[in-house]
């Protein structure tokens, strides 16, 4: 019963988003053409944390199209054979191999746009994924590692007097957890799932009368949210003189 | 939504003793401590006690330990919070407030005068 | 007891401006606490809880931040109808304890 008690007074403190991360496109501006090949070939692999459920847009080298002959999207996921997608300039032929997910498109086709889309991003998303371009003065490319992160759902509950479990559920990467005011906590457990994601799970107990509330803090590449609950009162206890 | 509503503005004389009244609508009266403040003209909040209705389970400050008595009726969904040995200076706004101090209670005016 | 160390205790802005009020608890303890607005004659209404989440049907323009013993409230660009006393409460230990209040008046 105190379990369901407790978890009638919980309330949610923050929850405020990475807005560095809802950004879909790590794409430069066109115009801004790179003269100088050495320039984007020291930009060749980035990484690339995303959300997952965003729309995400990854972009070649910015070569010039007249100077193209070749662009190839290289797409290497978790489990999965490696897929191309492939664009011949001069017979304005587009190529797929071993490429099954409906979601990574290219932008639109590739003569006026050479870059890729994944279109919601989903967790088996994760994985490398390479432009390719081939010029006379020989191959540019860029490559993205992608992680995707995943939001944990975050719960805090009273499972016995004065001992609170705060849990963040099926993140990716794992959250990590603190408390205010610091408590007698247990080892925190973390259980991983298939998909990649982790469920973080802190237990603590606060034998101090005087300790009203317990705030539970989540740290996330996603956000932070923390979650705060009035303790339920020692057993047996009536009335306090000076607790404090 | 919870609504807290309190009993009407007192009169009484220094010596005497006030019981002010909270009744709680809206949520599970007996899973959420309840708290009272108190507010003297022109001055600051003041926190007095909580009272858990659950279990009866109480804490005073020490400022009025000893003064101050709070109670709770769960068949009515009713706190309460007594006062006794007035003042002049326990005159008052008195406030009860639950859900962590998220929900409040428009107060009840204690006037202590001879 | 948790001391909360509120200031300024009162300011004289203009309308548009930004006011910024701060709260800090005692023996550097971490805690967390409310914001509260409060209007002659009335009971102090909740604006920020839980240090920075806003309250439903409170204006964007208020806000909070901080955590573990500082902490910060905001009114991005004052409003006429702003003009009160503002108040921190710790609800982490007991006692509650509230600052000393700030009253803000409009020039």
């Known amino acids: 019963e105190g379990a369901a008690q407790s978890n009638n007074s919980l309330m949610l403190q923050t929850s405020k988003e990475n807005h560095t991360l809802a950004s879909n496109s790590l794409c430069m501006d066109e115009k801004q053409i790179t003269q100088n090949h050495s320039k984007v070939l020291a930009e060749v692999n980035i990484s690339w944390p995303v959300q997952m459920a965003r729309n995400a847009v990854l972009c070649c080298p910015p070569i010039e199209f007249r100077n193209l002959i070749v662009i190839t999207w290289e797409i290497i996921l978790r489990g999965q054979p490696s897929c191309t997608k492939s664009y011949r300039k001069e017979t304005n032929e587009t190529k797929e191999t071993n490429c099954t997910d409906e979601r990574i498109t290219w932008v639109s086709t590739p003569d006026q746009n050479s870059d890729l889309q994944i279109h919601p991003v989903a967790i088996t998303h994760d994985g490398y994924y390479r432009c390719i371009m081939a010029t006379p003065d020989g191959n540019f490319h860029r490559g993205y590692h992608l992680q995707v992160l995943v939001t944990p759902e975050v719960t805090l509950f009273e499972s016995r007097n004065r001992t609170a479990v705060c849990k963040a559920v099926a993140g990716k990467p794992a959250a990590q957890i603190s408390w205010i005011p610091a408590g007698d906590c247990a080892p925190t457990e973390q259980e991983y799932w298939g998909n990649g994601t982790v469920t973080v799970k802190s237990t603590c107990h606060w034998e101090g009368h005087n300790v009203s509330t317990v705030t539970c803090h989540v740290s996330h590449l996603t956000g932070n949210k923390s979650l705060y609950i009035e303790l339920l009162p020692v057993p047996g206890a009536k009335k306090s003189a000076k607790l404090y | 939504e919870v609504q807290l509503v309190q009993s009407g503005a007192e009169v009484k004389k220094p010596g005497a003793s006030v019981k002010v009244s909270c009744k709680a609508s809206?949520?599970?009266?007996?899973?959420?401590?309840m708290h009272w403040v108190r507010q003297a003209p022109g001055q600051g909040l003041e926190w007095m006690g909580n009272?858990?209705?659950?279990?009866?389970?109480?804490n005073y400050d020490e400022k009025f330990q000893g003064r101050v008595t709070m109670t709770a009726d769960t068949s009515t969904s009713t706190v309460y919070m007594e006062l006794s040995s007035l003042r002049s200076e326990d005159t008052a706004v008195y406030y009860c407030?639950?859900?962590?101090?998220?929900?409040w209670g428009r107060g009840t005016l204690v006037t202590v005068s001879s | 007891d948790i001391q909360m160390t509120q200031s300024p205790s009162s300011l004289s802005v203009s309308v548009g401006d930004r006011v910024t009020i701060t709260c800090q608890a005692s023996q550097g303890t971490p805690i967390n606490l409310h914001w509260f607005q409060q209007k002659p004659g009335k009971a102090p209404k909740l604006l920020i809880s839980?240090?920075?989440n806003l309250e439903s049907g409170v204006p964007s323009r208020f806000s909070g931040s901080g955590s573990g013993t500082e902490f910060t409230f905001t009114i991005s660009s004052l409003q006429p109808e702003d003009a009160a006393t503002y108040y921190c409460?710790?609800?982490?230990?007991?006692?509650?304890?509230f600052g000393q209040g700030t009253k803000l008046e409009i020039k």
């Open positions: 809206g949520h599970t009266f007996t899973s959420y401590w």
């Open positions: 009272i858990y209705p659950g279990s009866g389970s109480i």
């Open positions: 407030l639950t859900m962590t101090g998220t929900s």
């Open positions: 409460l710790q609800f982490t230990y007991i006692p509650w304890t």
């Open positions: 839980g240090a920075s």
